[in-house]
């Protein structure tokens, strides 16, 4: 298992096998050449994105099934914002500006995307959820 679930928003991390301890700062976890931060408090999607930006990161951009499964395991039963958003008439976009190529399905009918261990869905962006940031290894 990649991490243990303790209580909502609180996690005990065990380092994934490809982690390089020196590559990610304290409180960040390394996986697949990215550093991840998982919040212990809740914010709106925009506020969470701003929090990630303060650390030179974005809300999590998910590039592969491997990354997705990793994040779902870490998220556990709690809903966590990730960096995918839909604006009216526009294609889905990641928080780094890249267009989403629909490699997974988003359930729900709202603008901002969250994940937990069982699903990737959408919710009103103003709702306060935990969140996940990521950035490339330095």
């Amino acid at each position: 298992s990649v991490g243990q679930y303790n209580c909502p928003g609180q996690y005990t991390f065990s380092m994934p096998s490809d982690s390089h301890v020196s590559s990610c700062s304290e409180d960040w976890v390394g996986y697949q050449r990215k550093c991840y931060f998982i919040s212990t408090v809740k914010r709106s999607w925009t506020s969470a994105q701003n929090a990630c930006s303060e650390h030179g990161a974005t809300l999590a951009v998910i590039d592969s099934e491997k990354d997705m499964n990793f994040l779902k395991r870490y998220a556990g039963r709690e809903e966590h914002w990730v960096g995918l958003k839909k604006e009216p008439g526009h294609p889905w976009k990641w928080s780094n500006g890249k267009e989403f190529n629909n490699w997974f399905n988003v359930t729900g009918s709202d603008k901002c995307v969250f994940l937990k261990n069982t699903e990737v869905s959408s919710m009103e962006c103003e709702k306060n959820l935990y969140w996940i940031c990521n950035k490339p290894y330095k």
């Epitope: 604006e87 009216p88 008439g89 359930t107």
Partner: antibody, heavy 119, light 107 residues
């Protein structure tokens, strides 16, 4: 109450230009995404373009890309559609529509303005 | 682009009857689907969004269901003012697209 009033439609020759306006009232215009949707005579609805509340982000249907430009003036509570290089197939009633705040769906539409492209 | 196919093209019913309108998407649109009502010479009116959420002021006789590729608009008991054309619209994929419409006419 919410009101959207389109104007600027009329008869224009193929290759010509037209600028449509949509005057908004009864809500805080600058807080809403706005869109243009058209309907050819006796046909269904076709989404044309969208603009973000601040005017920075726009998106277009492939059928009008490079020919139409959506814009807005929040100080005048007005939405615009500049239509260039008009074709016969652009003949339609053009509606402006407001998106529900913080959502993805068009909850209020104007009554439309007819654009006829013909020689 | 995602193609929405509505059926039937025309539905002939009497006031008080139940109307069931179908909308099928060429690929999944999750629950990002809306229904609009349009009467001749008028602008479209939003009825349902997010597959099943009634817009403000829409009577309870209108309901929406479905997900993925198959969606239904149900009018439980037709009122005289419900005879109109109904369009489905998806907002999952860009560009947004509409179905070709279903006309509900008086039998």
């Amino acid at each position: 109450q919410v009101q959207l009033v389109e104007s600027g439609g009329g008869l224009v020759q193929p290759g010509g230009s037209l600028r449509l306006s949509c005057a908004a009232s009864g809500f805080t215009f600058s807080n809403y995404y706005m869109s243009w949707v058209r309907q050819a005579p006796g046909k269904g609805l076709e989404w044309v373009s969208v603009i973000s509340y601040d005017g920075i982000s726009t998106h277009y249907a492939d059928s009008v890309k490079g020919r139409f430009t959506i814009s807005r003036d929040n100080s005048k509570n007005t939405l615009y559609l500049q239509m260039n290089s008009l074709r016969a197939e652009d003949t339609a009633v053009y509606y402006c529509a407001r998106y529900i705040g913080n959502s993805l769906y068009m909850d209020f539409w104007g009554q439309g303005t007819l654009v006829t492209v013909s020689s | 682009d995602i193609v929405l196919t509505q059926s039937p093209a025309t539905l002939s019913l009497s006031p008080g009857e139940r109307a069931t309108l179908s909308c099928r998407a060429s690929q999944s649109v999750s629950s990002y689907l809306a229904w609009y009502q349009q009467k001749p010479g008028q602008a479209p009116r939003l009825l349902i969004y997010g597959t099943s959420i009634r817009a403000t002021g829409v009577p309870a006789r209108f309901s929406g269901s479905g997900s993925g590729t198959d969606f239904t608009l149900t009018i439980s008991s037709l009122e005289p003012e419900d005879f109109a054309t109904y369009y489905c619209q998806q907002e999952y994929s860009s560009p947004p697209t509409f179905g070709q419409g279903t006309k509900v006419e008086i039998k």
